[in-house]
């Protein structure tokens, strides 16, 4: 993983068993129609690679021309390859949409390593496995990148599903879900599953592969099992959440809980990993090492470098710890945790060893822009932003990866006091610098 | 300072088990620093790795011997041990013990090889 | 499988000359690599660890370089002691499994 750029993102797909589906809590909200319920079209309609990000269809223009886009909680564009590239069997042809609409404005998005750079335009969109809706959205004609797409991933743009503050280049472009739900009745909120395999796939098991879900406009109850916990989006640029303590196998990091949020957290899935601030990456580390140490790994591979290969079939989750993260609660003084396995942050990897062995990548990495929830994390969770009530929702997903022994949770309520101290306030001088960083 | 001394018969016969040991001395095989390996090599012909062993008994297999290899440790005495089974001509070889370090990556130390020929 | 493929498999040079051994990864290893020297009767011996760093008590006229796929090894002015086979090792995937076949360097 090339970890100073958010992408690519890691998914993996199928395979994996079921979570135990727990009987529904009775404290769960009243049904809000339109929200919640059975989304039958747009189930399943993910796909993805090992590391290379979750992608949907999509159409844009007319005719509509066909592109898959990854889907991205980290960014505010809606941007699509709009040029010849080596990577890319496809791109978008505005010449050829009649609807297209050139907004004679360029836009340049640098990464800290990579960039992308294109012309505005707007132009009718629509997602075929989503609602039966098309809008016009602005999208950004990818013409020149630098590290940005990806050989082999299968997708041609990136859809940022995060707010306008963010947007490039600034946060007078509409974002694409901000239109969605402007000029259509769809509710303002989408919820994710995604999927990873527990096991690498080759490009065609991708292709013929079920990667997750993006429901949008509503919940999908067969998406999950057990209650979903609502915790509140501090504000409204990523999607930033506040993180009150953290434990691994149950033991306390013990650090300031400001320290878990600086400069920030949020929720990303076009991240792959679990990125921790470099104080709290290190105590985790040491922790988890602690906790494994039957078995010794080399620094390279707790610096998410070198892999680690077992015997297929042998690797031995029981000596890696659960990790918990709590998070903030819809109510005053109330917490609830979000607790992942190793099968969600030891990543597999492909093509490298035999076919005698399972190998693995140390998901978990440092981060100098604050905490990211990537795929690590949402892997193990059905995960709902709720715009319109300003929360993100998790609840354990039936397709996250487990053994007989330990499964991913989301449990509470637990008394968690001052949990307004836990946020950090980033000066305003420093806000720019730091979104071209996204290390 | 440490060293490694392999030990064990020279000559083993065809479908038999192959057994060697390796003494540490200078150092304790119980350094948490260290992973402890056996590696071999036929006459003439390049190095391939067997397997490795840490003091708590966790052990890595070469994929390719998996079936027919154990590795196991001694703390008390300082030793660990190789043991190839069902072994033939192809198994013939210098077979080395070392110590994997520079943070479990490398073997930085070597013992310096016992020629074990597979013969009726 | 990553494989290692070092080249040439002899090198016939003189002392003093400088030599210089290369070691191609079927995919990248990163700098997970090391150089191993082994002459006849003796066991292999460390020579760099991590692509470029020498290890314990060798010489500096050996030097090593490269990441990703391609690595080489250096030997900037050839001692009578340093005509030996010598081995690249990656560690990328660990545990450290993989030797590549070994460059024989020869007294011309």
């Known amino acids: 993983t090339q970890h100073g750029i958010r992408l690519p993102l890691r998914s993996g797909l199928g395979g994996a068993p079921l979570g135990l589906r727990l009987p529904r809590e009775t404290d769960e909200e009243p049904e809000e129609p339109g929200r919640r319920g059975s989304f039958v079209e747009m189930v399943d309609n993910l796909r993805g690679k090992s590391g290379q990000g979750y992608y949907v269809e999509m159409t844009v223009g007319s005719p509509p021309q066909t592109l898959n886009i990854l889907v991205d909680t980290g960014s505010s564009n809606f941007a699509v390859g709009a040029a010849p590239h080596p990577f890319l069997h496809r791109y978008y042809q505005r010449q050829l949409s009649s609807t297209y609409r050139d907004l004679r404005k360029g836009v340049y998005v640098p990464y800290t390593q990579g960039k992308w750079e294109g012309e505005l335009g707007t132009d009718l969109v629509s997602i075929p496995h989503g609602p039966n809706v098309t809008v016009r959205a602005n999208i950004a004609a990818i013409t020149e990148s630098d590290k940005f797409f990806i050989n082999g991933s299968n997708w041609e743009g990136i859809l940022g599903l995060a707010y306008a503050e963010i947007a490039r280049p600034d946060d007078s472009l509409e974002p694409f879900f901000d239109s969605l739900v402007k000029q259509t009745h769809v509710p303002n909120l989408f919820s994710l599953q995604l999927c990873g395999a527990g096991f690498p796939l080759n490009q065609s098991e991708v292709l013929a592969s079920v990667g997750g879900s993006m429901i949008i406009g509503g919940i999908d109850h067969s998406l999950y099992t057990g209650s979903l916990w609502y915790t509140p989006i501090r504000r409204e640029w990523y999607y930033e959440v506040i993180i009150v303590r953290v434990e691994i196998n149950g033991q306390d990091l013990k650090m300031d809980c400001k320290e878990y949020n600086y400069d920030k957290s949020i929720v990303d899935s076009g991240t792959t990993n679990l990125r921790l601030p470099k104080k709290v990456f290190e105590a985790a580390v040491k922790s988890i090492k602690a906790a494994s140490s039957t078995e010794k790994f080399p620094d390279g591979f707790w610096l998410g470098e070198q892999l680690v290969c077992w015997q297929a079939g042998t690797t031995p989750w029981n000596i890696f710890p659960v990790i918990s993260l709590y998070l903030m609660g819809e109510v005053t003084n109330q917490s609830f945790r979000i607790t992942i396995l190793p099968q969600q942050y030891l990543r597999p990897v492909e093509d490298v060893a035999t076919s005698q062995d399972d190998c693995y990548k140390f998901a978990i990495s440092q981060s100098s822009t604050g905490t990211v929830m990537g795929a690590v994390i949402m892997e193990g969770f059905y995960v709902v932003f709720d715009r319109a009530r300003k929360r993100i929702g998790f609840a354990v997903s039936a397709c996250h990866v487990h053994d007989e022994f330990r499964t991913a949770a989301v449990e509470g309520p637990f008394v968690t006091l001052d949990m307004e101290d836990c946020g950090y306030n980033i000066p305003q001088t420093d806000e720019s610098t730091l979104m071209t960083g996204r290390a | 300072q440490l060293q490694l001394q392999e030990s064990g018969p020279g000559l083993v016969k065809p479908s038999e088990t192959l057994s060697l040991t390796c003494t540490v001395s200078g150092g304790s095989i119980s350094s948490s620093s260290y992973y402890w390996g056996w590696i071999r090599q036929p006459p003439g012909k390049g190095l391939e790795w067997i397997g490795n062993?840490?003091?708590?008994?966790?052990?890595y297999y070469n994929p390719s011997l998996r079936s027919r290899v154990t590795i196991s440790v001694d703390t008390s005495k300082n030793q660990f041990f190789l043991k190839l089974s069902s072994v033939t001509a192809a198994d013939t070889a210098v077979y080395y013990c070392?110590?994997?370090?520079?943070?479990?990556?490398?073997?930085?130390?070597w013992g310096r090889g016992t020629l074990v020929t597979v013969s009726s | 499988e990553i494989v290692l493929t070092q080249s040439p498999a002899t090198l016939s040079l003189s002392p003093g000359e400088r030599a210089t051994l290369s070691c191609r990864a079927s995919?990248?290893?990163?700098?997970?690599l090391a150089w191993f020297q082994q002459k006849p009767g003796q066991a292999p011996r460390l020579l760099i660890y991590?692509?470029?760093n020498r290890a314990t008590g060798i010489p500096a006229r050996f030097s090593g370089s490269g990441s990703g796929t391609d690595f080489t090894l250096t030997i900037s002015s050839l001692e009578p002691e340093d005509f030996a086979v010598y081995y690249c090792?990656?560690?990328?995937?660990?545990?450290?499994?993989?030797f590549g076949g070994g460059t024989k360097v020869e007294i011309k």
């Open positions: 995919q990248s290893v990163s700098s997970y």
């Open positions: 991590d692509a470029s």
């Open positions: 062993i840490y003091y708590s008994g966790s052990t």
């Open positions: 090792q990656q560690v990328y995937v660990w545990p450290p499994r993989t």
């Open positions: 070392a110590r994997l370090g520079h943070g479990y990556n490398y073997f930085d130390l």
